[in-house]
């Protein structure tokens, strides 16, 4: 029977995409999360909306992705920042924008940066600005590892499903 | 017989890359398209030149990639923009640059943005400029879905095989 | 029979790249290299430290990645550049920053650019700057091909495992 012997999320996937009557050996954990646009001053990841999903064992816990099984994963994330011109009366201070994917593992007592991108923005008079950051790479991860993000400049995020996202898939 | 029942491009690929004595279950649809450098004021995707290719069912239709089979795909694209300094006589107007990968599906009556990157550029006197945008992510797609791009700032594209491209592969 | 039941392009692929007749059918070549932070004015790739690795046949040769078996690979790289404000006594000259992944194969008497990103930076007074570049795409590669990088602006690299990296994995 379709989905028999599959994890619940795999069975659901099998029903949605009947292409994949997969033996357990061919399960392909994958996740794509989007930033919750209703939370303007924080970056909360969601998997239950729009094009976001969790497949074959990935789960969300405390705004982190939990690695379902040990192996090599491609991990990626994007953010887009924007801002208005500063007012002539205000002084223009430089803005440090950064986005990082971090690993928290029982092997280490701290968050290890996996992917980091950074930018200095100097807002000008009458000059709205926009900046995009993307990164992704392959990492050897262990079951139970936690993947999270840290962002400097959250109030400037352009929160939409196509601009701010975070994901991973097993190779 | 080798090539029996294969599409012509698949048969050709098989001859070129004899590495894959693969059963159907291991077909790996993949595509990498490059912007046609002979078309300066439009962005036309090509798969029959340089390092570009369509493999295992991907095809091009109306400048869109057609998804060959339902499943999860990693979709990516890059553009590079450039411009000259504005002339002292001209007024410098800000340039909005953007690049988006869109999904057109029978499920929706409109193009859904999957990946978006944006930038505001303020050309200065004697200041040529260059800007790169890249993005990619995993999406659940359905057979027959159309993946296309929309770009603001096409006249400024640096059209070469290594700077402007669009691709996808099945996970 | 090899290729029977495949689409034509698949049959062609099967003849060209006769793939992995090994218990190796499950081998997944992958590599992730990081820029050596102890080498400040060059970009030397390392795979034996931090989160870097070579798996299932990838190997290093003269600062290049050697492709372990013919097939399609996703190849990616990132760099982050930074700089200080120029001194008021110095003249500010524009900085050309670029990062390229190149393919060297004796088919061609030169390195073929696969992925290129570029940026012009205009350092200002009291204005430190930061810039990130990322790119990645799928390419048909042949066993023994050499993947390397070329960077303009090496003295400005922010060399850390999460900011400067280069990798590839078989699809």
């Amino acid at each position: 029977l379709p989905g028999v012997g599959l994890t619940p999320s795999a069975a659901q996937t099998a029903r949605q995409h009947p292409k994949m009557h997969l033996a357990h050996s061919t399960l392909k954990p994958a996740a794509h999360l989007i930033g919750d646009p209703s939370k303007q001053n924080s970056l909360l990841w969601r998997a239950n909306t729009d094009r976001a999903f969790l497949q074959d064992g990935f789960s969300l816990s405390n705004n982190s992705l939990l690695v379902p099984t040990s192996g090599i994963y491609f991990v990626y994330s994007q953010v887009v920042f924007s801002g208005k011109a500063y007012s002539p009366k205000a002084t223009s201070s430089p803005l440090y924008l950064a986005h990082e994917v971090q690993l928290f593992s029982s092997q280490y007592p701290f968050h290890v940066p996996l992917l980091s991108s950074q930018k200095m923005v100097y807002p000008g008079l009458q000059e709205p600005w926009l900046h995009s950051m993307y990164h992704g790479a392959a990492f050897q991860l262990t079951q139970g590892d936690q993947l999270s993000t840290h962002t400097d400049g959250i109030p400037h995020l352009v929160l939409s499903p196509s601009t701010v996202f975070f994901g991973a898939f097993a190779l | 017989l080798p090539g029996v029942g294969l599409t012509p491009s698949a048969a050709q690929t098989a001859r070129q890359h004899p590495k894959m004595h693969l059963a159907h279950s291991t077909l790996k649809p993949a595509a990498h398209l490059i912007g046609d450098p002979s078309k300066q004021n439009s962005l036309l995707w090509r798969a029959n030149t340089d390092r570009a290719f369509l493999q295992d069912g991907f095809s091009l239709s109306n400048n869109s990639l057609l998804v060959p089979t339902s499943g999860i795909y990693f979709v990516y694209s890059q553009v590079v923009f450039s411009g000259k300094a504005y002339s002292p006589k001209a007024t410098s107007s800000p340039l909005y640059l953007a690049h988006e990968v869109q999904l057109f599906s029978s499920q929706y009556p409109f193009h859904v943005p999957l990946l978006s990157s944006q930038k505001m550029v303020y050309p200065g006197l004697q200041e040529p400029w260059l800007h790169s945008m890249y993005h990619g992510a995993a999406f659940q797609l359905t057979q027959g879905d159309q993946l296309s791009t929309h770009t603001d700032g096409i006249p400024h594209l640096v059209l070469s095989p290594s700077t402007v491209f669009f691709g996808a592969f099945a996970l | 029979l090899p290729g029977v039941g495949l689409t034509p392009s698949a049959a062609q692929t099967a003849r060209q790249h006769p793939k992995m007749h090994l218990a190796h059918s499950t081998l997944k070549p992958a590599a992730h290299l990081i820029g050596d932070p102890s080498k400040q004015n060059s970009l030397l790739w390392r795979a034996n430290t931090d989160r870097a690795f070579l798996q299932d046949g990838f190997s290093l040769s003269n600062n290049s990645l050697l492709v372990p078996t013919s097939g399609i690979y996703f190849v990616y790289s990132q760099v982050v550049f930074s700089g200080k404000a120029y001194s008021p006594k110095a003249t500010s000259s524009p900085l050309y920053l670029a990062h390229e992944v190149q393919l060297f194969s004796s088919q061609y008497p030169f390195h073929v650019p696969l992925l290129s990103s570029q940026k012009m930076v205009y350092p200002g007074l009291q204005e430190p700057w930061l810039h990130s570049m990322y790119h990645g795409a799928a390419f048909q590669l042949t066993q023994g091909d050499q993947l390397s990088t070329h960077t303009d602006g090496i003295p400005h690299l922010v060399l850390s495992p999460s900011t400067v990296f280069f990798g590839a994995f078989a699809l």
Epitope: - | - | R15, H24, T49, L60, L66, S105
Partner: antibody, heavy 118, light 107 residues
Framework: EVQLVESGGGLVQPGGSLRLSCAAS????????IHWVRQAPGKGLEWVGY????????NYNEKFKGRATISSDKSKNTAYLQMNSLRAEDTAVYYC???????????WGQGTLVTVSS | DIQMTQSPSSLSASVGDRVTITCRAS??????VAWYQQKPGKAPKLQIY???HRYTGVPSRFSGSGSGTDFTLTISSLQPEDFATYYC?????????FGQGTKVEIK
């Protein structure tokens, strides 16, 4: 069945040259590189370099660069090792090998002995 | 170049014995090590790749382990056909280098 057969070994004068052949069968010749590895009498193994018949790509051990040339002829399913300026320490059994993944020498020929002596 | 140092250079053992051969790399090589078996007058045969993966057709009594700089080939119960010389090889970076060999002889 993959088969590699070397030929061309024998006695060579110091300063002379050799051209070894490696005839391959049992697989698609252009799908894998051919390595050359040598072994001096009673000694260990030493990688010389490889050639990819598909695109004529090569990679050499720096030790042999300039003295060794590895090539192939697709029409004959044969790879070649040319070595010049031979010296006594080049006396060895020379093997050609086909990998699975690039750096793993999975299939070997029987070897051909080259003796450099006056 | 990376140096691969094998120990011991030779050992004597009996059928049924557990045999361990070690190989040390002069720098960290991740898990990029292979092991080969060679009998007199014959070409080497690939036994283990990627430090711990048995090549097709290699009996399960052969196992490999290690990462970084220290690697081990173990034969859990030596058989008559296992008497040979064993070489480790690093596949981390060119020029790929081999250890000097360990000769396993009959006691």
């Amino acid at each position: 069945e993959v088969q590699l057969v070397e030929s061309g070994g024998g006695l060579v004068q110091p300063g002379g040259s050799l051209r070894l052949s490696c005839a391959a069968s049992g697989y698609t010749f252009t799908s894998y590189v051919i390595h050359w590895v040598r072994q001096a009498p009673g000694k260990g193994l030493e990688w010389v370099g490889y050639n990819n018949p598909y695109n004529d790509g090569t990679n050499y051990n720096e030790k042999f660069k300039g003295r060794a040339t590895i090539s192939s002829d697709k029409s004959k399913n044969t790879a070649y090792l040319q070595m010049n300026s031979l010296r006594a320490e080049d006396t060895a059994v020379y093997y050609c090998s086909r990998p699975t993944m690039l750096p793993w020498f999975a299939y070997w020929g029987q070897g051909t002995l080259v003796t450099v002596s006056s | 170049d990376i140096q691969m140092t094998q120990s011991p250079s030779s050992l004597s053992a009996s059928v049924g014995d557990r045999v361990t051969i070690t190989c040390r790399a002069s720098q960290a090589v991740s898990s990029a090590v292979a092991w080969y078996q060679q009998k007199p007058g014959k070409a080497p045969k690939l036994q283990i790749y990627s430090a711990s993966h048995r090549y097709t057709g290699v009996p399960s009594r052969f196992s490999g382990s290690g990462s970084g700089t220290d690697f081990t080939l173990t034969i859990s119960s030596l058989q008559p056909e296992d008497f040979a010389t064993y070489y480790c090889q690093e596949s981390y970076s060119t020029p790929w280098t081999f250890g000097q060999g360990t000769k396993v002889e009959i006691k």
